[in-house]
Interface confidence: low
């Protein structure tokens, strides 16, 4: 499990770097951040470290009330500050890893970090 979570953390950060360059990658992180009400890997300041993200900007999916452009010149009170790795990791341990194995292939590269089915289950329960 620790290996899987370490892999998840590494992949999440890797996908963050691809966010400005790849719509598909962006969509994965957007869905996760919006559904789990989180922002960045450890916290929202991680987005400052992404070279091609403009300064003082987070993805719109970090916003508490998501609207297009809400992440530009954001107000800290208007975004989710908690990091996604810890939040999703805790949920994964509790709800997914105990019920089924997640292969490294599922967690790797351009694959979904968590299956849409799992996200949907979280989102509606």
């Amino acid at each position: 499990r620790d290996k899987v979570m370490s892999e998840f953390n590494n992949n999440f950060r890797q996908q963050m770097e691809n966010y400005p360059k790849n719509n598909h990658t962006a969509s994965i992180l957007d869905r996760m951040q919006a559904d789990f009400k989180c922002c960045g890997a450890a916290n929202y300041t991680d987005w400052e470290k992404i070279p091609s993200m403009s300064k003082n900007r987070v993805p719109d999916s970090c916003c508490i009330n998501v609207t297009v452009g809400c992440g530009i010149n954001f107000n800290e009170k208007a975004i989710h500050k908690e990091g996604c790795v810890e939040k999703i990791g805790g949920w994964l341990r509790k709800n997914v890893l105990e019920q089924k194995l997640i292969s490294e292939e599922d967690l790797g590269g351009e694959q979904k970090l968590i299956s849409e089915e799992d996200l949907h289950h979280h989102h509606h329960h």
Partner: antibody
Framework: QVQLVESGGGLVKPGGSLRLSCAAS????????MNWIRQAPGKGLEWITY????????YYADSVKGRFIISRDNTKNSVHLQMNSLRAEDTAVYYC????????????WGQGTTVTVSS | DIQMTQSPSSLSASVGDRVTITCRAS??????LNWYQQKPGKAPKLLIY???SLQSGVPSRFSGSGSGTDFTLTISSLQPEDFATYYC??????????FGQGTRLEIK
């Protein structure tokens, strides 16, 4: 250019089966989820199924659940829809569509293939 | 499931007119709303995504607005090629992906 081309439509009797195929070109197919959306004659658009980029997550509309199966072959840039136990109400134009992302609409549609279920 | 309701179902207008089509979601969908245009015998074409962003290649006379539950598609000055059926679609809570029932725009 970015393109989706459907094939496999035709006339089939109620209870019969049909397999639709969609050939993708001009983009990195394995990066994208894919959908099938249909439109009955004179009616609106109805989403029926999608498959994720890796092929391991699939969702179906209640109207086709248990009868239709979506699959994809990333090595051949293709997505398929196996339609079983066909009914008259499945008569429609079937579109292969690149998946909508969170902030992006469905920007690439095939030309559609017509399925007619009639005795 | 989120239901999408468009109004009007059909409308008649003349070239040069300003036209507005509305779409209402059964619950808040933030800005996850897309608009499509479909001409007879053709596949739908994406016009607007994320409620107000114009898809590449779409004329600037098309615009979208709204957030939450109420959205509008506006055509500032109708052109002959704009007579078609328009659909809204939510991408907030999927599956299922849901569309409005369509608005048919006809020549007066």
């Amino acid at each position: 250019q970015v393109q989706l081309v459907e094939s496999g439509g035709g006339l089939v009797k109620p209870g019969g089966s049909l397999r639709l195929s969609c050939a993708a070109s001009g983009f990195t197919f394995s990066d994208y989820y894919m959908n099938w959306i249909r439109q009955a004659p004179g009616k609106g658009l109805e989403w029926i199924t999608y498959i994720n980029n890796g092929g391991y997550t699939k969702y179906y509309a209640d109207s086709v659940k248990g009868r239709f199966i979506i699959s994809r072959d990333n090595t051949k840039n293709s997505v398929h829809l196996q339609m079983n136990s066909l009914r008259a109400e499945d008569t429609a134009v079937y579109y292969c569509v690149r998946d909508p992302r969170m902030y992006y609409g469905m920007d690439v549609w095939g030309q559609g293939t017509t399925v007619t279920v009639s005795s | 499931d989120i239901q999408m309701t468009q109004s009007p179902s059909s409308l008649s207008a003349s070239v040069g007119d300003r036209v507005t089509i509305t779409c209402r979601a059964s619950q808040s969908i933030s800005s996850y709303l897309n608009w499509y245009q479909q001409k007879p015998g053709k596949a739908p074409k994406l016009l607007i995504y994320a409620a107000s962003s114009l898809q590449s290649g779409v004329p600037s006379r098309f615009s979208g607005s709204g957030s939450g539950t109420d959205f509008t598609l506006t055509i500032s000055s109708l052109q002959p090629e704009d007579f078609a059926t328009y659909y809204c679609q939510q991408s907030y809570s999927t599956p299922p992906i849901t569309f409005g029932q369509g608005t048919r725009l006809e020549i007066k």
